[in-house]
Interface confidence: low
């Protein structure tokens, strides 16, 4: 079963070069696999990274940078992704989903 | 194992739509990207879009954007592929395939096929 | 969205090795570490046979590999065999998903 990609989209606006933190309000009892994607206008949406409740470790997908990007859980219920040294091409909505079967 | 099972053959006159349907099984269905591709007679494959259930909005090549509709019926795992406004170029076999890796980019990894689905489009 | 060029066709003899490039652009190619091969035999759906570049799917034999340069990726097959006659088709993520303009792969 999966769950649906839930909350209202915050918009963050940050300079070239800056830093910027996203948050993901996660469902109660949400344990696993929390994903976080990339959707920019005209492409799929591209999944950046997961990371493992279970270990407390992110898996970055082929292709990005580490250091690029950074998620850790501040709460059970709470999940932040950190965009580090931002570019234009950074630009697009950021999803945090989960699932779990 | 996964299993992907697309509806048959289909004659159609120019001008009229056609939807083809591409049922899956053995697997999760919400979080695998599934891509539409099709193959004229002697051709290539060319993408035509995409869909990841759990986002529940499809991506579409330029080409066909307008004229084509991708959905998921995650009820039923289930995918659908509708074409409108059909021409004779659009005769084609037309498959879905499944992304290898969950929450993937539609082209990436195409890792399971269904059989095709022949469309003719004939006056 | 303009396909990715590859040749026409390439051919070799059995036990030789093959190499067929597929050429892209900055934004797709060279961009993503996200290229992946299929092979169609006639009449059959298309195979993955390598996916993110480099990777095989259990089950594809060790004798295909891929890599990347650039905005160029390329197939080898090495140790040919009869059974690898068949049609090869590059693809790329990027600003569209696209399929490469697709090599007959002749064993002579």
């Known amino acids: 079963k999966s769950s649906n990609l839930e909350g209202r989209t915050k918009s963050v606006i940050r300079q070239t070069g800056s830093s910027a933190e996203i948050t993901c309000d996660l469902a109660e009892g949400s344990t696993g696999y929390i994903h976080w994607y990339l959707h920019q206008e005209g492409k799929a949406p591209q999944r950046l990274l997961y990371y493992d409740s279970y270990t407390s470790s992110v898996v970055l997908e082929s292709g990005i940078s580490p250091g690029k990007y950074d998620t850790y859980g501040s709460t059970r219920k709470n999940l932040r992704m950190i965009l580090r040294n931002l570019i234009e091409n950074d630009s697009g909505v950021y999803y945090c989903a989960t699932w779990d079967g | 194992e996964v299993q992907l099972v697309e509806s048959g053959a289909e004659v159609k006159k120019p001008g009229s739509s056609v939807k083809v349907s591409c049922k899956a099984s053995g697997g999760t269905f919400s979080s695998y990207a599934i891509s539409w591709v099709r193959q004229a007679p002697g051709q290539g494959l060319e993408w035509m879009g995409g869909i990841i259930p759990i986002f529940g909005t499809a991506n579409y090549a330029q080409k066909f954007q307008g004229r084509v509709t991708i959905t998921a019926d995650k009820s039923t795992s289930t995918a659908y592929m509708e074409l409108s406004s059909l021409r004779s170029e659009d005769t084609a076999v037309y498959y879905c395939a499944r992304s290898l890796r969950d929450g993937y980019n539609y082209i990436g990894s195409l890792g399971y096929w269904g059989q095709g689905t022949l469309v003719t489009v004939s006056s | 969205q303009s396909a990715l060029t590859q040749p026409r066709s390439v051919s070799g003899s059995p036990g030789q090795s093959v190499t067929i490039s597929c050429t892209g652009t900055s934004s797709d190619v060279g961009g993503y570490n996200y290229v992946s091969w299929y092979q169609q035999h006639p009449g059959k759906a298309p195979k993955l046979m390598i996916y993110e570049v480099s990777n095989r799917p259990s089950g594809v034999s060790n004798r295909f590999s891929g890599s990347k340069s650039g905005n160029t990726a390329s197939l080898t097959i090495s140790g040919l065999q009869a059974e690898d006659e068949a049609d090869y088709y590059c693809?790329?993520?990027?600003?569209?998903?696209?399929f490469g303009t697709g090599t007959k792969l002749t064993v002579l």
């Open positions: 693809s790329s993520y990027g600003s569209g998903s696209v």
